[in-house]
């Protein structure tokens, strides 16, 4: 049998946010139902994780031996602290789209570990704020965006923006 440390060396995690409790659930991406030591996990999910607090989970299973895999869960900031904001100026709305993630509340997570990503059509931007210029008037554009904490996606949003009519004579 392999050690659990080896077997789950490359385990990945998804973070799911509960807006009512303002707590996260970490979903462990494994095929079998593992045990989590002191942290009880139900159906490979670790519940009630506080934003920006690290949690240590000891992963074991009867298909592997000691030592267990110690997984550090780097819990992201609360999702409601981020808002996707349309920053397009009215006078330029016929050919321009501006989108910005606003941090309306502070949090204790290290901002260095946060990555922003926008995808508008086939264009990808790794920025917190994007401005697309020289667009076609009266066209619909879809932009998908996501925020990652330590390379784990924890929130996403999409916006469909229709550019305004062009000025007469343009």
């Amino acid at each position: 049998k392999p050690t659990c440390d080896e077997k789950y060396a490359n385990i990945t995690v998804d973070y799911l946010y509960n807006k009512e409790t303002k707590l996260f659930t970490a979903k462990l991406n494994v095929n079998e139902n593992v045990e989590c030591g002191n942290n009880t996990c139900t159906s490979n999910e670790v519940h009630n994780l506080t934003e920006c607090k690290n949690a240590s989970v000891s992963i074991s299973h009867n298909s592997c031996t000691a030592p267990d895999k110690t997984l550090i869960l780097d819990v992201p900031p609360g999702v409601e602290k981020f808002q996707l904001h349309d920053c397009t100026q009215v006078e330029k709305a016929d050919t321009t789209i501006c989108l910005k993630w606003k941090n309306i509340e502070t949090f204790t997570c290290d901002t260095q570990n946060i990555t922003y990503r926008f995808q508008c059509g086939n264009m990808i931007f790794d920025n917190k704020e994007i401005k697309l210029e020289n667009l076609e008037p009266e066209h619909e554009y879809k932009c998908d965006s996501e925020i990652l904490y330590n390379n784990h996606k924890f929130t996403n949003a999409s916006k469909i923006i229709k550019t305004d009519f062009g000025s007469p004579g343009e």
């Epitope: 920053c87 501006c98 910005k100 606003k102 941090n103 309306i104 509340e105 502070t106 901002t111 260095q112 946060i114 990555t115 922003y116 790794d126 920025n127 917190k128 704020e129 994007i130 401005k131």
Partner: antibody, heavy 119, light 113 residues
Framework: EVQLVESGGDLVKPGGSLKLSCAAS????????MSWVRQTPEKRLEWVAY????????YYPDTVKGRFTISRDNAKNTLYLQMSSLKSEDTAMYYC????????????WGAGTTVTVSS | DVLMTQTPLSLPVSLGDQASISCRSS???????????LEWYLQKPGQSPKLLIY???NRFSGVPDRFSGSGSGTDFTLKISRVEAEDLGVYYC??????????FGGGTKLEIK
């Protein structure tokens, strides 16, 4: 190491122009809003310019509006302050400072660069 | 513009004493979102300012717990429970509620009595 290093300060005559630079390192510059703050010889701190992370929004107090322009080059991790029509009251130590968003705080400051406006 | 007035201008203290600095704004700095963006910075001699407190009472990481901030509306206070030699310098309050018109207080110099 997170660092901001200002440069470009000089002695300039009233009515003259000057461009300050602030080189950022050790962090994802394009994710941070940035500001210029100056300190007068009397040691008063004055906020003089603000720019959003992607350079879309800029703000200035009335004292410098129309004379100062803040800009940034995220590819070069550099913040700029173009100053024109300089007055003696613009004499100060100029600091660049980062602020993760408008509702956050200035958590990292540079060491400053000195601008003297005198004939 | 929001005017931030600090008192006293100079504060002579003995090491180990408590120090209290007041900051008053000319109008309420409670933002419509319910938050009050009042910050305190310390500038030691020959250095750039450093953040101590944000949103009235939140200590920035690494700031000793002898520093505390309080207040609401227009009146705010920074307290240092037991002054140490490394605390000497000029303290500035700052309001970030009226974006984008940020304003600093005039400063309070903490010095040895």
């Amino acid at each position: 190491e997170v660092q901001l290093v200002e440069s470009g300060g000089d002695l300039v005559k009233p009515g003259g122009s000057l461009k300050l630079s602030c080189a950022a390192s050790g962090f994802a510059f394009s994710n941070y809003d940035m500001s210029w703050v100056r300190q007068t010889p009397e040691k008063r701190l004055e906020w003089v310019a603000y720019i959003s992370s992607g350079g879309v929004s800029t703000y200035y107090p009335d004292t410098v509006k129309g004379r100062f322009t803040i800009s940034r080059d995220n590819a070069k991790n550099t913040l700029y302050l173009q100053m024109s029509s300089l007055k003696s009251e613009d004499t100060a130590m100029y600091y660049c400072a980062r602020r993760y968003d408008v509702w956050w705080y200035f958590d990292v400051w540079g060491a400053g660069t000195t601008v003297t406006v005198s004939s | 513009d929001v005017l931030m007035t600090q008192t006293p201008l100079s504060l002579p203290v003995s090491l180990g004493d408590q120090a209290s600095i007041s900051c008053r704004s000319s109008q309420s700095i409670v933002h419509s979102n319910g938050n009050t963006y009042l910050e305190w910075y310390l500038q030691k001699p020959g250095q750039s300012p450093k953040l101590l407190i944000y949103k009235v009472s939140n200590r920035f990481s690494g700031v000793p717990d002898r520093f505390s901030g309080s207040g609401s509306g227009t009146d705010f206070t920074l307290k240092i429970s037991r002054v140490e030699a490394e605390d000497l310098g000029v303290y500035y309050c700052f309001q970030g509620s009226h974006v984008p018109m940020y304003t600093f207080g005039g400063g309070t110099k903490l010095e040895i009595k």
